[in-house]
């Protein structure tokens, strides 16, 4: 009776209804349910679709742009609980841009355990004011229900019985208003006595058992719940999982072999991102918490003696640390199986953050490369680093490589720090604040003295405060697309071509052509330029067929101007003369591409034969917008509109007076205040600073949510495997 069907994994159903049938036998969706981006579906496609077995979703329910879907009452008639274990941007229920949805109709939804509700931009959606969300979830104040038809007071929601002058549905008070509560014109909202809390009640109003959640078929019986407040085990709801069971996914009890199967399935699969489940604190969880390590015989997490020895195997043998976030991925590692490249350009409280995340590393099997870390003053955040093995070496046989670190003053405090480098050489170039004496001290301590060759430690670019380039590099080829720029420049070779280490390409967005090389750089490591390292091209003896060095800049913004320059990276010659070259700063604009969608369309009818549309320009025009395309289609009339008795008490008239939508906002304000002045002898007050700030914050929050939604739901198409198991997705 309790969860009569199957436990199904989270689902993302898009483009068409084909995969919706996978829900047929599901009682619980362990994960989220997303139904979205169906542009060709029609109301009749949903007529015979129903999933009465679905009782609970453990994460969230998201509906986005599903055309033709007018109500959820038939689709999910028995959905009772959305747990919100994982949320979509803080929301457990998201209904966004559902163009044909007229009502929610989730008349059995009794509990949203965690998270809140976001219902936005559904221009046909009514029956929102008739739902008392406080009976379903705790954090009602975090709900975001805006820009629906309901906002315009044009809905005329009629609860069951109202048409016959009766009140069938319970009424509750919200904001001082005593209102009947219903989901549709034929379904009341079930409101249980307050003493039942969130456990639910029977039709007669008797409370369900305290372990129930939302509803039950008989009172005070944990085997007759529709869903469980805590955990589900063998047909009954329990407060906690008794031995030999373990808590799983915050809602059910599983045995050891279930957890073990999950562990081995992941261990034996090549799928990235799966978890080798372990057991800790009576829970079957994805991984051991910090300070614990897994006992492979019984999957139990056991406390480490001292810091946990944690060998971290790096994908592809190396990892670039370019932010605190990427450093956090190595938190707790004591042995790095691979090589580390440190490339930190800026950040807050860096030394402390880096020490917290990298401070336990004792050994690196490959090489350590510190490259262009403008923000670093010292490497002392590698507090416990004692050994660099050099089993894999940077090109040139280097196991320690320090290149172009503008503010690096100290390696370690050599009076307190021991470091052994088993094999490989040291490389130091372009560290203007790092004294040679510090480098020579490292040679002695690390046991690398005598390994270095003449140009491995540059005498003039370490510990100096200046460097100069004396030749001009010219760009020979520039090609743009909407997100790429391909650059080539004339070859440059110093008198001894081996002195050329490569090129550095600097670029950044530049709306105006007034950029200088040193903009945005400061002693704290801030640098507004993005920098790319480029190897020198293969050298040809024939000057005519010299390869032009170049770089393809990817992932750029459309219709955006970039400032770009390139300079050489050279060693210093014996004669202590500086060679090198640098280009002027050039400005290149990427091409235009398709704009994002126009925002906030509003339609107003000013007569029986006209509709006036108004919208805002897209947030990302991606070019100069020359025109908009407007499409329209005649819709069939809704029979419900004819059946309503518009003279009924309680029906609100549309309160919106028609005003030409293309007037400037200023003139609208002016007209409005005149109107109010004549009617009520007062004018509208100017907005306070806090009101303006609140509006700005709300606008920003809305944009952030939309960006998040688009980033999550629009994913690259997956290849069709021929099994029908993977869904083609819009890119």
């Amino acid at each position: 009776h309790l969860y009569p069907g199957e436990v199904c994994p989270g689902m993302d159903i898009r483009n068409n209804l084909t995969r919706l049938h996978e829900l047929e036998n599901c009682s619980v969706i362990e994960g989220h349910l997303q139904i979205l981006l169906m542009f060709k579906t029609r109301p009749e496609d949903f007529r015979d679709l129903s999933f009465p077995k679905l009782i609970m979703i453990t994460d969230y329910l998201l509906l986005f742009r599903v055309y033709g879907l007018e109500s959820l009452k038939d689709l999910f008639p028995n959905l009772t609980v959305i747990r919100g274990s994982r949320l979509f941007f803080n929301y457990a229920l998201v209904i966004f841009e559902m163009v044909h949805l007229k009502e929610l109709g989730l008349y059995n939804l009794m509990n949203i355990t965690r998270g809140s509700v976001r219902i936005e931009k559904n221009n046909e959606l009514c029956y929102l004011a008739t739902i008392d969300w406080s009976r379903i979830l705790d954090s009602v104040e975090d709900n975001y229900i805006v820009l629906n038809k309901d906002d315009n007071e044009e809905c005329g929601d009629i609860c069951p019985g109202t048409a016959k002058g009766k009140t069938n549905c319970p009424a509750t008070v919200i904001n001082g208003q005593f209102v009947e509560r219903c989901w549709t014109h034929s379904h009341c909202q079930k409101v249980c006595p307050t003493i039942c809390k969130s456990h639910g009640c029977t039709a007669e109003g008797l409370c369900c058992h305290s372990e129930c959640l939302g509803n039950c078929s008989q009172p005070d019986d944990p085997t007759k719940c529709v869903a469980c407040r805590n955990f589900y085990l063998d047909g009954r709801c329990v407060e906690t999982c008794p031995p030999p069971y373990y808590h799983f996914q915050d809602w059910r009890c599983v045995n050891f072999s279930f957890c073990q199967d999950l562990h081995h399935k992941c261990k034996n699969s090549r799928r990235q991102g799966c978890h080798q489940y372990v057991i800790h604190n009576n829970k079957c969880i994805p991984e051991c918490p910090s300070g614990y390590t897994m006992n492979s015989s019984n999957l139990l997490c056991t406390p480490c003696l001292g810091p946990c020895p944690k060998v971290c195997h790096l994908l592809e043998g190396e990892k670039t640390i370019d932010s605190v976030t990427s450093a956090q991925e190595l938190r707790g590692c004591t042995v790095i199986n691979g090589s580390l490249i440190i490339n930190i350009r800026g950040g807050n409280n860096l030394a402390a953050e880096l020490e917290a995340n990298l401070g336990l590393i004792e050994e690196i099997s490959g090489y350590l490369k510190i490259r262009r870390s403008y923000a670093l003053v010292s490497l002392s955040f590698f507090r416990k680093l004692r050994l660099i093995r050099g089993e894999t070496l940077e090109i040139g046989n280097y196991s320690f490589y320090a290149l172009d670190n503008q503010n690096l003053r100290q390696l370690w405090d050599w009076s307190k720090h021991n470091l052994t480098i088993t094999q490989g050489k040291l490389f130091f170039h372009y560290n203007p604040k790092l004294c040679l004496s510090e480098i020579h001290k490292m040679e002695e301590v690390s046991g690398t003295k005598g390994r270095q060759e003449r140009n491995d430690i540059a005498l003039k670019t370490n510990g100096d405060q200046a460097s100069c380039e004396n030749e001009l590099l010219k760009f020979s080829y520039i090609r743009t697309s909407f997100d790429k720029i391909l650059l080539r420049w004339e070859p440059y070779w110093p008198p001894d071509f081996r002195d050329l280490l490569g090129f550095m390409l600097f670029y950044k967005e530049a709306p105006y052509q007034n950029v200088t090389e040193f903009d945005g750089q400061d002693a704290c490591g801030s640098n507004s330029w993005t920098v790319v390292d480029i190897d020198p091209p293969l050298r040809s003896n024939d000057p005519k067929s010299q390869n032009h060095p170049g770089w393809l800049m990817r992932g750029l913004k459309p219709w955006t101007q970039y400032a770009i320059f390139v300079k050489t990276l050279v060693t210093f010659s014996d004669e202590r003369r500086t060679y090198g070259a640098k280009s002027d700063i050039i400005y290149v604009q990427t091409d235009a591409t398709n704009p994002s969608v126009p925002l906030d369309p509003i339609s107003v009818s000013n007569s029986s034969s006209q509709i006036i549309l108004k919208w805002k320009p897209p947030s990302d025009p991606n070019g100069n917008i020359t025109h908009y395309l407007v499409f329209w289609e005649r819709q069939a009339e809704d029979s419900e509109l004819f059946e309503l008795d518009y003279c009924l008490k309680g029906l609100k008239l549309p309160s919106r007076t028609w005003s030409p939508p293309f007037e400037s906002e200023d003139s609208q304000k002016h007209n409005q205040s005149e109107y109010e002045d004549s009617a009520g002898e007062c004018c509208s007050c100017p907005k306070t600073d806090s009101q303006i700030l609140k509006e700005l914050e709300e606008s920003s929050f809305r944009k952030t949510f939309e960006d998040y939604l688009h980033n999550v739901v629009f994913v690259p198409r997956k290849t069709s495997s021929g099994t029908g198991a993977e869904d083609p997705r819009p890119s």
Epitope: S476, Y477, I478, R479, S481, K484, R488, G550, L552
Partner: antibody
Framework: EVQLLESGGGLVQPGGSLRLSCAAS????????MSWVRQAPGKGLEWVAV????????DYAHSVKGRFTISRDNSKNTLYLQMNSLRAEDTAVYYC???????????WGQGTLVTVSS | QSVLTQPPSASGTPGQRVTISCSGS????????VNWYQQLPGTAPKLLIY???KRPSGVPDRFSGSKSGTSASLAISGLRSEDEADYYC???????????FGGGTKLTVL
């Protein structure tokens, strides 16, 4: 109607030179990068050279670099390919093509045959 | 030797669905969009599909393109005798810094 029309092909001896022309009509010639693409008899397509809208940037396939020069005259809506030091392996039908997203070929000419033979 | 690999030939009967593959690498198809061309006997190539799956106006919807990883494919449904031609794929190649073509596939309608 958007059209490209090549001319200037013919028979030439190895080591000789030839200049191909491509007359464009029906579109704003100066707004597009243009390419030459060739097809040896019974073989596939091979990109030869490209030129930017204003003619300031050019690029060539390795096989022709240093021997061929692409140029354009926007006032005459014409694209050129100057071919020097011709070899037998340069024998092909040469097409001029309008570029789209860095790849030639949203519009093609009918082609002109170049035969390099002694 | 072409950078992009296509089968030299393909065939089908009228009304059938035929697929032509085009295999590349991460530096071309893997990171850039693919175009498909049709070359009828004795004529210049004609753009059939651009940006992996978009059709220029005038190209029937029987022709469709797709891309996955470092491979692309052209599908022709409801095959007709006038579809008998050579078909070429093309993409930009980041490492060669230029456009590359497939060797072409000769489609025969039986």
């Amino acid at each position: 109607e958007v059209q490209l029309l090549e001319s200037g092909g013919g028979l030439v001896q190895p080591g000789g030179s030839l200049r191909l022309s491509c007359a464009a009509s029906g579109f704003t010639f100066s707004s597009y990068w243009m390419s030459w693409v060739r097809q040896a008899p019974g073989k596939g397509l091979e990109w030869v050279a490209v030129i930017s809208k204003d003619g300031s940037s050019t690029d060539y396939a390795h096989s022709v670099k240093g021997r061929f020069t692409i140029s354009r005259d926007n006032s005459k809506n014409t694209l050129y390919l100057q071919m020097n030091s011709l070899r037998a392996e340069d024998t092909a039908v040469y097409y001029c093509a309008r570029d789209r997203d860095w790849i030639p070929g949203d519009v093609w000419g009918q082609g002109t045959l170049v035969t390099v033979s002694s | 030797q072409s950078v992009l690999t296509q089968p030299p030939s393909a065939s089908g009967t009228p009304g059938q669905r035929v697929t032509i593959s085009c295999s590349g690498s991460s530096s071309n198809i893997g990171s850039n969009s693919v175009n498909w061309y049709q070359q009828l006997p004795g004529t210049a190539p004609k753009l059939l599909i651009y940006d992996n799956n978009k059709r220029p106006s005038g190209v029937p919807d029987r022709f469709s393109g797709s891309k996955s990883g470092t491979s692309a494919s052209l599908a022709i449904s409801g095959l007709r005798s006038e579809d008998e031609a050579d078909y070429y794929c093309a993409a930009w190649d980041d490492s060669l810094s230029g456009p590359v073509f497939g060797g072409g596939t000769k489609l025969t309608v039986l």
